[in-house]
């Protein structure tokens, strides 16, 4: 019987010879559980596992803790891959995180973190980041040191308010912090003075809601 090949991430898919962008089935580390992810096989050498994408407002990102844990949306469009998979994956080996952003004026920027991982669910999927480079701000728009993940039904932020309920979306809120890529999607000409929009403070400031975002990860030794 032919042994089925399984892939942990899009870097493994790429190295196996599949170099076309698209949706691939990945397997949880040390498990047979599977998950579908979009693989970017072209940007910056390819092998990128897309863990988040916003582009048109077609998917509601004001979701529960469980939904952010397991993932939601459509890998070919707007989606969240899932905190549990990303946590397990990024604790197996060292990963880099690239965040690609687009504004409504045709500009693009990115932030690249040379080391990224999420803690386990017991530690509220706290984000850990090191080594920022890129064009989307010299200071990290994800607060350092990293914060716990919060959702509308899981308030782990440092604000007297409830950031996820107020600003919408699950995110690593501080009080409430310089970013929220899972906020409300606002169309062009309605995207300024939006305090609950898609925010990356150190690129566009506090009230500007972005047009598109992609979060992608790849092994550091790719």
């Amino acid at each position: 019987k032919e042994e089925q090949i399984s892939f942990r991430d899009c870097a493994e898919v790429f190295k196996s010879g599949h170099t076309t962008n698209g949706i691939y089935t990945l397997t949880f580390p040390n498990s047979t559980e599977e998950i579908k992810a979009y693989c970017d096989m072209e940007a910056g050498g390819g092998g990128w596992t897309i863990i988040q994408r916003r582009e048109d407002g077609s998917v509601d990102f004001q979701r529960t803790w469980k939904e952010y844990k397991v993932g939601f949306g459509n890998p070919s469009g707007e989606y969240w891959l899932g905190n549990e998979f990303v946590s397990q994956l990024t604790n197996q080996q060292r990963y880099v995180l690239k965040i690609h952003l687009k504004d409504w004026e045709g500009n693009e920027a990115y932030s690249l973190y040379e080391h990224f991982y999420l803690s386990s669910e017991e530690l509220n999927y706290r984000i850990h980041l090191k080594g920022l480079t890129g064009t989307a701000g010299k200071i990290s728009s994800i607060s350092q040191p990293g914060n716990d993940f919060s959702t509308k039904d899981g308030d782990n932020d440092k604000c007297i308010c409830k950031c996820s309920q107020m600003l919408t979306g699950g995110w690593w809120f501080d009080a409430c912090g310089p970013s929220n890529l899972n906020g409300m999607y606002y169309p062009q000409r309605q995207n300024t003075n939006k305090f609950n929009g898609i925010k990356w403070y150190y690129w566009k400031g506090s009230g500007y809601s972005l047009k598109a975002t992609t979060m992608m990860i790849r092994p550091a030794d790719f």
Partner: nanobody, 115 residues
Framework: DVQLQESGGGLVQPGGSLRLSCAAS????????MSWVRQAPGKGLEWVST????????GYADSVKGRFTISRDNAKNTLYLQMNSLKPEDTAIYYC????????WGQGTQVTVSS
Amino acid sequence: DVQLQESGGGLVQPGGSLRLSCAASGFTFNSYAMSWVRQAPGKGLEWVSTINSGGGRTGYADSVKGRFTISRDNAKNTLYLQMNSLKPEDTAIYYCNADHPQGYWGQGTQVTVSS
């Protein structure tokens, strides 16, 4: 610790007035623009007004222009919102917000306009 404490909300009849205050502490208040933002029942956040750090420039949402006035007293680390000619559609929780990287928020103050 950073704190923003809104006060001055309450129940008022249509056409009435209220003055909201926001007391700030724990950060350099006079270095940041400040805003008032509101959230009506079952709705998302709506920008109301912004004032620059020195107090010389202001902006207002069309829905409140001519009725609301934002001001600040940097010596007292306090932001204000004078609300006149109140309408039922002004009913909301009102938050002050600092244009700081953290985007600090308070708990809000409830304004209810009803006869």
